[in-house]
Amino acid sequence: DGPAGSWEQLIQERRSHEVNPAAHLTGANSSLTGSGGPLLWETQLGLAFLRGLSYHDGALVVTKAGYYYIYSKVQLGGVGCPLGLASTITHGLYKRTPRYPEELELLVSQQSPCGRATSSSRVWWDSSFLGGVVHLEAGEEVVVRVLDERLVRLRDGTRSYFGAFMV
Amino acid sequence: DGPAGSWEQLIQERRSHEVNPAAHLTGANSSLTGSGGPLLWETQLGLAFLRGLSYHDGALVVTKAGYYYIYSKVQLGGVGCPLGLASTITHGLYKRTPRYPEELELLVSQQSPCGRATSSSRVWWDSSFLGGVVHLEAGEEVVVRVLDERLVRLRDGTRSYFGAFMV
Amino acid sequence: DGPAGSWEQLIQERRSHEVNPAAHLTGANSSLTGSGGPLLWETQLGLAFLRGLSYHDGALVVTKAGYYYIYSKVQLGGVGCPLGLASTITHGLYKRTPRYPEELELLVSQQSPCGRATSSSRVWWDSSFLGGVVHLEAGEEVVVRVLDERLVRLRDGTRSYFGAFMV
């Protein structure tokens, strides 16, 4: 590794450092598909952006391998807990990789939000936040799933979101 | 961009990298003003610090433009949910910018913590955590608001806090 | 600081930047000791890793001083709230330092998860997430404690975890 090589490497690193991969995707009316697939996200409007990461059908797609802090928050809410809706909500971040046929659980939370309804009000709100560092290879994808997604409240992109940045 | 220029830029970057902007502000007795304004924070004592960011009247003020992971946690608690105190709590991070007259919602959570009181105990505790990546320009500010702030419990700076770092 | 020195420093920084300290530790069957000590963690299998940080008896041990974003999530769950179990759960990140005999609270949450049980189901789930930036010196340690740890549900390492990265 001669001086010129090192120099090029440093210049290269400076440029790549300027675009340390990061993304923040926001909830939108189209986020809940009801198809059993992952949540879909807004990637450009408002607070949403992609920098050094790409997006495909609900997934953040890694272009540069490394350790990433990935996170998601979902806003949950309802009026009582209708029969047929699970009283346990599962909110998770999952990895898709060409090396395995099935999604791999990365970070998961289970909550029982309906217990938040009070005797004077059947309306309840709850929020679930997940965040943690995982290693992701180029081409791997991360998605968000919520079961039962009918309890996710979207509104304006500030209450339910999904993001990542390289650490 | 000659070698000397690149060299200066790299030296500069090394120095700026040493002070990657970061801050962690903690809750204090003076945090809750009751004035309808944002929460106020401790910036120096104990675990609190500012590095490459400044503070003004509850706001983290950006000095270097870029993408920041901003976060806040508030500890909520009470004895029952007295009438007139909102049974829905809204905890949010908001941006102030010279370009708009009103605050802009960045990250928001709604919770119904009073439902956590049980038949055997009217005492309840709940916690709300928010975190996400947003782009901030130099001079823009981020504040934390909680409605109803009377449900926020402060104590010692470890339970309610507000921070950010550049990614 | 001559050109050669600066060059060495930059090379050094590039190498150290490649190993920006980070870790993600996951919950395992052995995590809950019942001894009154901190939770123990998996450091190698599955999603767990250590990079530029070490581990000792439940603690992340800092090798390079600096500001770190530290985080932990614990999955809580139960069937009702048995008598003798505190209805308030405390989940916290604590620092151990050679300079003080006692652990120092860094980030703490209190929750009353049992209130999430509903009239139709005594089963409840809840999750507690903590994250924030703290300054850590080389040799200092961070641990996770949950009181009462009997309400922590482990399963597969995705629901309860502990991590950090330098910012």
Partner: antibody, heavy 121, light 111 residues
Framework: QVQLVQSGAEVKKPGASVKVSCKAS????????VHWVRQAPGQGLEWIGA????????SYNQKFKGRATLTADKSTSTVYMELSSLRSEDTAVYYC??????????????WGQGTLVTVSS | EIVLTQSPATLSVSPGERATLSCKAS??????????MNWYQQKPGQPPRLLIY???NLESGIPARFSGSGSGTEFTLTISSLQSEDFAVYYC?????????FGQGTKLEIK
């Protein structure tokens, strides 16, 4: 300044109902609870319940639930307490009081002048 | 419900002297460092007047000779130097649990 002005004394027969009013002024009516407390002659104070004028929510002492009804009229900044199925032991001075909060701890920082309700056959 | 017991029922003190009134709760009224106990003064023919809220906070406009202390189940109202206008009945009241309850009162009379 904050003022709570109550309606005048009432004499009622057992089994009847009484409705006492409390007109608020000097503060934002919809931002504070109004509580009702009674005091039998020569006795101590007893909490009846409270109403939140902002949305009409109420909270009652179980002892009075079903007999006491608390309501608020935002248009006139007036709160009402109706007590039905009156008995002689309901003879008391009835006070309205504004409820303030320190965190979730409530206290009564302004009181009406009181309304004497006499139940006698 | 939480029962509040005040003692003594009657307290005779001379003007200028210190008066100490006690209130005991049947269970703790503490939460997170706050005690949900309040004190009121009532004179004949008048409504009660708030003196102290949350055990030790002096209500605006109340003279500094009044102070409150205590936690858990035991609380005290102290009047450091009695003035003639202080002779009245004093009630403690808890707001920890519905129904809110009052003590039976302590009558402070001139000795």
């Amino acid at each position: 300044q904050v003022q709570l002005v109550q309606s005048g004394a009432e004499v009622k027969k057992p089994g009847a109902s009484v409705k006492v009013s409390c007109k608020a002024s000097g503060y934002t009516f919809t931002s504070y609870n109004v509580h009702w407390v009674r005091q039998a002659p020569g006795q101590g104070l007893e909490w009846i319940g409270a109403v939140y004028p902002g949305n009409g929510d109420t909270s009652y002492n179980q002892k009075f639930k079903g007999r006491a009804t608390l309501t608020a009229d935002k248009s006139t900044s007036t709160v009402y307490m109706e007590l039905s199925s009156l008995r002689s032991e309901d003879t008391a001075v009835y006070y309205c009081a504004r409820g303030s909060y320190y965190y979730t701890s409530s206290y009564f920082d302004h009181w009406g002048q009181g309304t004497l309700v006499t139940v006698s056959s | 419900e939480i029962v509040l017991t005040q003692s003594p029922a009657t307290l005779s003190v001379s003007p200028g002297e210190r008066a100490t009134l006690s209130c005991k709760a049947s269970q703790s009224v503490d939460f997170d460092g706050d005690s949900y106990m309040n004190w009121y003064q009532q004179k004949p023919g008048q409504p009660p007047r708030l003196l102290i809220y949350t055990a030790s906070n002096l209500e605006s406009g109340i003279p500094a000779r009044f102070s409150g202390s205590g936690s858990g189940t035991e609380f005290t109202l102290t009047i450091s130097s009695l003035q003639s206008e202080d002779f009245a009945v004093y009630y403690c009241q808890q707001s920890y649990e519905d129904p809110f309850t009052f003590g039976q009162g302590t009558k402070l009379e001139i000795k």
